[in-house]
Amino acid sequence: ARNGDHCPLGPAACCALHTVRASLEDLGWADWVLSPREVQVTMCIGACPSQFRAANMHAQIKTSLHRLKPDTVPAPCCVPASYNPMVLIQKTDTGVSLQTYDDLLAKDCHCI
């Protein structure tokens, strides 16, 4: 079924939103970001079997062709469908300033 939400691989195995706690050092941002000092990064992780959360017709085709030709056609990838904005306090040449990043945190996920 298109945009199916049943995961045949078992709970938590398929494409879904996960939160990973990361420090500025983990992200390689310590030299230019001042706050937050730790980020709750929401990201899309998991497999994309069958028609699970297929984003569009192209993703459905990709799934079908991957079953037929797994060496040629990769499986769909779990990626953000939309994002939450986040503000960073950062160092610049002219001093400390605010910058909002619209595509920093995943809001929900699909397979594409």
Epitope: S35, N84, P85, T100
Partner: antibody
């Protein structure tokens, strides 16, 4: 360009409830890490932090005033509201709202003077 | 709550003089902000997180400190620096401000 503007009743009588509105533009309370804070300043005196409301609707209050303070927000209309119950003359002050980014009062409104008498 | 004590309460300085304002915390804090408030206006940030100059702030301002003792230095005072200066901590709630230092220019 970030702007904030406070509005209030101007003059209020003791024991009444003070209702303040902060109307802002140039940022969104849907943004992670963003909040609005309230600070007051009696004439000729220092700054006193009152409360913060955050993007995720978390609210933090000055413990000395917590029982009298109520914070709320209307994210779609870019407004934050502060109510202070049972006011007395000690609540006479200029009330500021400010954009908070994580831990920083980055931009401030011009303030609104409230007199309790 | 963490009490911030600023000294001196009032400081008078001559043009071109280097001055230092101090802020002492009743408990250790990780960082300190400094705000400037000129007469009849709202405060604006000068120093973010102890030592980082906010955008647009002249380089004659600098901050330092750690633990319970923090300071704001103006390397060469100018007439436009006449204002009230407040330290501010957010290491723990309730967030608190110092009582302020009023800088007057001779």
């Amino acid at each position: 360009q970030v702007t904030l503007k406070e509005s209030g009743p101007g003059i209020l009588q003791p024991s009444q409830t003070l209702s303040l509105t902060c109307s802002f533009s140039g940022f969104s309370l849907n943004t992670h890490g963003m909040g609005v804070g309230w600070i007051r300043q009696p004439s000729g005196k220092g700054l006193e932090w009152l409360a913060n409301i955050w993007w995720n609707d978390d609210k933090y209050y000055n413990s000395a005033l917590k029982s009298r303070l109520t914070l709320s927000k209307d994210t779609s209309n870019n407004q934050v509201f502060l109510k202070i119950s049972s006011v007395d003359t000690a609540d006479t002050a200029t009330y500021f709202c400010a954009q908070v980014a994580w831990d920083w009062f980055a931009y401030w409104g011009q303030g609104t003077l409230v007199t309790i008498s | 709550q963490i009490v911030l004590t600023q000294s001196p309460a009032i400081m008078s300085a001559s043009l071109g003089e280097e001055i230092t304002l101090t802020c002492s915390a009743s408990s250790s804090v990780r960082y300190m902000h400094w705000y400037q408030q000129k007469s009849g206006t709202s405060p604006k940030v000068l120093i973010y997180s102890t030592s980082n100059l906010a955008s647009g702030v002249p380089s004659r301002f600098s901050g330092s400190g750690s633990g319970t003792f923090y300071s704001l230095t103006i390397s060469s005072v100018e007439a436009e620096d006449a204002a009230d200066y407040y330290c501010h901590q957010w290491s723990s709630y309730p967030w608190t401000f110092g009582g302020g230092t009023k800088l007057e220019i001779k």
